[in-house]
């Protein structure tokens, strides 16, 4: 851009340097050139010159319009052609920019993540503005009335450290830019119910040599919550759809869990926990891929092809609708929710 | 309860430069997002730059590249430096809690002159 050019005469920009995407707009020069009266003035956009709609106001000044600006930034820049100088003359120039006044922030979300120290706030900012755009995160305590502000480009993180004279906030976001400024809707906000605890991985898998084999899964976490409630799920990497276990989990030992699959398979899983009746998930953990053995019986069991009984214990019996079967045959099968639809969630997808 | 006072204005040439201050009482300043506005003669008040407790900092257009916001916790003093003024940037001056606003809080303020 042209931030630090020496002028001999002005350059204007109607309506202003930022302006609204779509605007019409004038950009004016005027020459105050010493010996030179010049034959023409010459506009250039980003080092081109222009042809048209171009006006020569009288003998200092001229005028080049253009109809419905939409570039983000030019650099305009004007010249004389002096009579006798070989090379035109530089006049001045100006940085321009289009762009959007801000949308109204939405989706505001803050969350605590265990043992960072930081609240962090998210939220989305809408359609792209073009134009420098700024958000002032606004933290209120509901039990003080102190309001503290920070400024942010996307997201927030803030010391828990100066959140410690209160547990109850109202938080809300404004976004500013040159053209206009909006506000977010107010997030009521509690310090106890937004945490959410500790990354939950899974650490290793293995496949039992079994008559119906038998794949256990071993998860972990650090975190310091006593009542945590999990989602496991799980596909073959073949298959789009997520099969997904629900646990109750107790993270002071690893955490072990039984599932019946297809064999000779290559499967993907994912964990994630919150806070037992807390709102806030982690994010799904990193995909643990693992290989079961090929079949050693002749059974070959599908399982997204029969009912299941949701429960949100460890397992989930698979039953058959029939009351004749004897008890003794009624087979308990591994849990596996087939919810009939993609598991949803803040994740990334595999597969 | 708060108090606010500005200094460092004064009489200078287009071109020049100044350092306002802004002393600080009656709250947590380390805590707190400030801002500076400013009043030309006759007109209304313009918001000219803000400071967030962690030192991020946003500007007015009119001033972006040529004012500086800083703040100093330790002395509980807001800042702006102003360089290669303009005529148009002589207004009285004014400091004020939070980071973006056209109001101030009933400060003395102080008066910069930019005339050859």
């Known amino acids: 851009g042209i931030t630090s050019i020496n002028c001999s005469g002005d350059m204007w920009v109607e309506p202003g340097e930022i302006f609204q995407m779509g605007m019409n707009v004038s950009i004016y020069c005027q020459e105050a050139l010493k010996h030179c009266r010049p034959r023409n003035l010459y506009f250039y956009k980003n080092g081109f010159k222009e042809e048209f709609d171009i006006t020569r106001i009288n003998r200092t000044t001229a005028r080049i319009w253009y109809k419905g600006f939409s570039e983000p930034h030019a650099y305009m820049h004007c010249t004389a052609e002096c009579p006798g100088h070989f090379q035109e003359t530089l006049i001045c120039g100006k940085d321009i920019s289009s762009g959007h006044p801000p949308d109204a922030p939405s989706n505001l979300t803050c969350v605590i993540y265990e043992y960072s120290g930081n609240m962090t706030c998210t939220w989305n900012t809408g359609k792209p503005t073009y134009i420098d755009t700024k958000y002032i995160v606004h933290v209120k305590s509901l039990e003080t009335e102190e309001e503290q502000q920070y400024l942010a480009s996307s997201y927030v993180k803030i010391s828990t450290d100066s959140l410690q004279g209160s547990r109850k906030y109202l938080v809300w976001v404004q976004a500013v830019n040159s053209l206009g400024m909006e506000n977010s809707q107010q997030l009521h906000v509690h310090l106890d119910d937004i945490v959410i605890p500790s990354a939950s991985i899974i650490s290793r898998a293995e496949t039992t040599n079994d008559t119906v084999p038998k794949t256990i899964v071993y998860w972990k976490s650090k975190t310091m919550i006593e009542k945590v409630f999990c989602e496991m799920r799980y596909k073959t990497t073949t298959n789009q759809t997520w099969s997904v276990k629900e646990f109750d989990a107790n993270f002071t030992y690893v955490q072990q869990s039984e599932f019946y699959l297809e064999p000779d398979s290559k499967y993907v899983f994912q964990v994630r926990c919150q806070e037992t009746g807390k709102r806030n998930w982690q994010p799904w953990s990193s995909p643990f891929v693992h290989q079961t053995s090929q079949e050693t019986g002749k059974r070959n069991w599908q399982p997204w092809s029969s009912p299941f009984v949701h429960q949100t214990s460890q397992t989930v019996s698979q039953v058959t609708a029939k009351s004749s079967h004897e008890p003794q045959k009624m087979e308990m099968l591994s849990a596996t929710i087939f919810r009939g639809h993609p598991a949803s969630g803040n994740h990334q997808d595999i597969g | 309860q708060v108090q606010l006072q500005e200094s460092g204005g004064g009489l200078v040439q287009p071109g020049g430069s100044l350092r306002l201050s802004c002393a600080a009482s009656g709250f947590t300043f380390r805590l707190t997002a400030m801002r500076w506005v400013r009043q030309a003669p006759g007109k209304g008040l313009e918001w000219v730059s803000g400071i967030d407790s962690r030192g991020s900092t946003i500007y007015a257009d009119s001033v972006k590249g040529r004012f500086t916001i800083s703040k100093d916790n330790a002395k509980n003093t807001l800042y702006l430096q102003l360089n290669s003024l303009k005529t148009e940037d002589t207004a009285m001056y004014y400091c004020?809690?939070?980071?973006?606003?056209?109001?101030?809080?009933g400060s003395q303020g102080t008066q910069v002159t930019v005339s050859s």
């Open positions: 004020a809690q939070g980071v973006y606003g056209d109001t101030h809080s």
